[in-house]
């Protein structure tokens, strides 16, 4: 068991188009942060939030991902295949890895919803 | 298989900077799941840590060793080095360098190279 | 900084003996403690790591115990090559600390 714990916003569900927060917060640790990997379900890395470097998007996400807020991820004009898992790497030292995860659902906007946003009372 | 080799000069005048090179190879410096660390043994006594780097340059040490340390990272050359300044008899010592490893919590030194001997003396 | 103490320093053993070699921690490191062994003029080598798992190539006669501050290294039937320094190593927190080390000698 390790000393820290990862914090995750869980289980989120978001609109198609819309935009969502994935968030992961370390704590109960001294361990020292030296970066955060975001990686979707196929495991392919989204980003890097390095201690030194900064923020690192990698190309194929960089039209729909936006660094933070803090050490979080906000995805972008959110499509259906966006559903499914995401993980958060904290990698610190002396403490190693730490792996948050987070489950998202894209919704479909329903002909209800849309119509009831323009519902005049 | 990876392995680390330690160089540099085995001969060093008090009060100048020790610089030593752990050269990496059969594996990447650069993965994101591991550091690399320093450590040194003076003769006939016990092991001091002495400090761990990550490789964008993130770098813990040792207090006991004030800031008389640096360690600097080379991810073209697969490299991570180790600059002692104003360095005494006491800094006499074999220094290895390690990664820290393998993936698990808190990980201990799982690769060590064979070590160097430094004498501090005029 | 966490203190860790071996003891004994030095033992004398014969072959085939069943040794223990004990290390104390001055305040809790719950199972982040690592074992090696060094032989004259080589580098250590890792034989345990979080109180009680083997690395990989390591003889089953080595063994780790203990969590909090006490931890014991066993070795269950002495062979030759196991003639050396061992050391234990907490991984808890920085500065990393090791112990003054366990010579195991022929008797």
């Known amino acids: 068991m390790m000393t820290g714990t990862i914090e995750t916003t869980g289980n989120i569900s978001a609109k198609k188009g819309g935009s969502v927060i994935l968030q992961c917060h370390l704590s109960s640790t001294m361990a020292q942060v030296t970066q955060v990997n975001w990686e979707q379900h196929d495991h392919s890395l989204l980003a890097i939030r390095n201690a030194e470097l900064g923020w690192h998007i990698y190309p194929a996400f960089k039209d729909r991902v936006a660094p933070g807020p803090g050490l979080g991820l906000t995805l972008q004009s959110l499509t259906m295949n966006d559903t499914g898992e995401y993980f958060c790497t904290y990698h610190t030292y002396p403490d190693g890895t730490y792996r948050g995860r987070i489950f998202l659902e894209v919704l479909e906007s329903s002909v209800a919803e849309h119509s009831a946003r323009f519902q005049i009372p | 298989q990876l392995q680390l080799q330690e160089s540099g000069p085995g001969l060093v005048k008090p009060a100048e900077t020790l610089s030593l090179t752990c050269t990496v190879s059969?594996?990447?410096?650069?993965?994101?799941?591991?550091?690399w660390t320093w450590i040194r043994q003076p003769p006939g006594k016990g092991l001091e840590w002495i400090g761990t780097?990550?490789?964008?340059?993130?770098?813990f040490h040792n207090p006991s060793l004030k800031s008389r340390v640096t360690i600097p990272v080379d991810t073209s050359k697969n490299q991570f080095s180790l600059k002692l300044s104003s360095v005494t008899a006491a800094d006499t010592a074999v220094y290895y360098c390690?990664?820290?490893?393998?993936?698990?919590?808190?990980?201990?030194?799982?690769?060590w190279g064979q070590g160097t001997l430094v004498t501090v003396s005029s | 900084d966490i203190q860790m103490t071996q003891s004994p320093s030095s033992l004398s053993a014969s072959v085939g003996d069943r040794v223990t070699i004990t290390c104390r921690a001055s305040q809790s490191i719950s199972s982040y403690l690592n074992w090696y062994q060094q032989k004259p003029g080589k580098a250590p080598k890792l034989l345990i790591y979080a109180a009680s798992s083997l690395q990989s190539g390591v003889p089953s006669r080595f063994s780790g115990s203990g969590s909090g501050t006490d931890f014991t290294l066993t070795i269950s039937s002495l062979q030759p090559e196991d003639f050396a320094t061992y050391y234990c190593q907490q991984s808890y927190s920085t500065p990393i600390t090791f112990g003054g080390g366990t010579k195991v000698e022929i008797k």
């Open positions: 390690a990664r820290v490893g393998p993936d698990v919590s808190h990980p201990p030194f799982d690769y």
């Open positions: 059969g594996g990447s410096i650069s993965s994101y799941d591991h550091y």
């Open positions: 780097v990550y490789y964008s340059g993130s770098t």
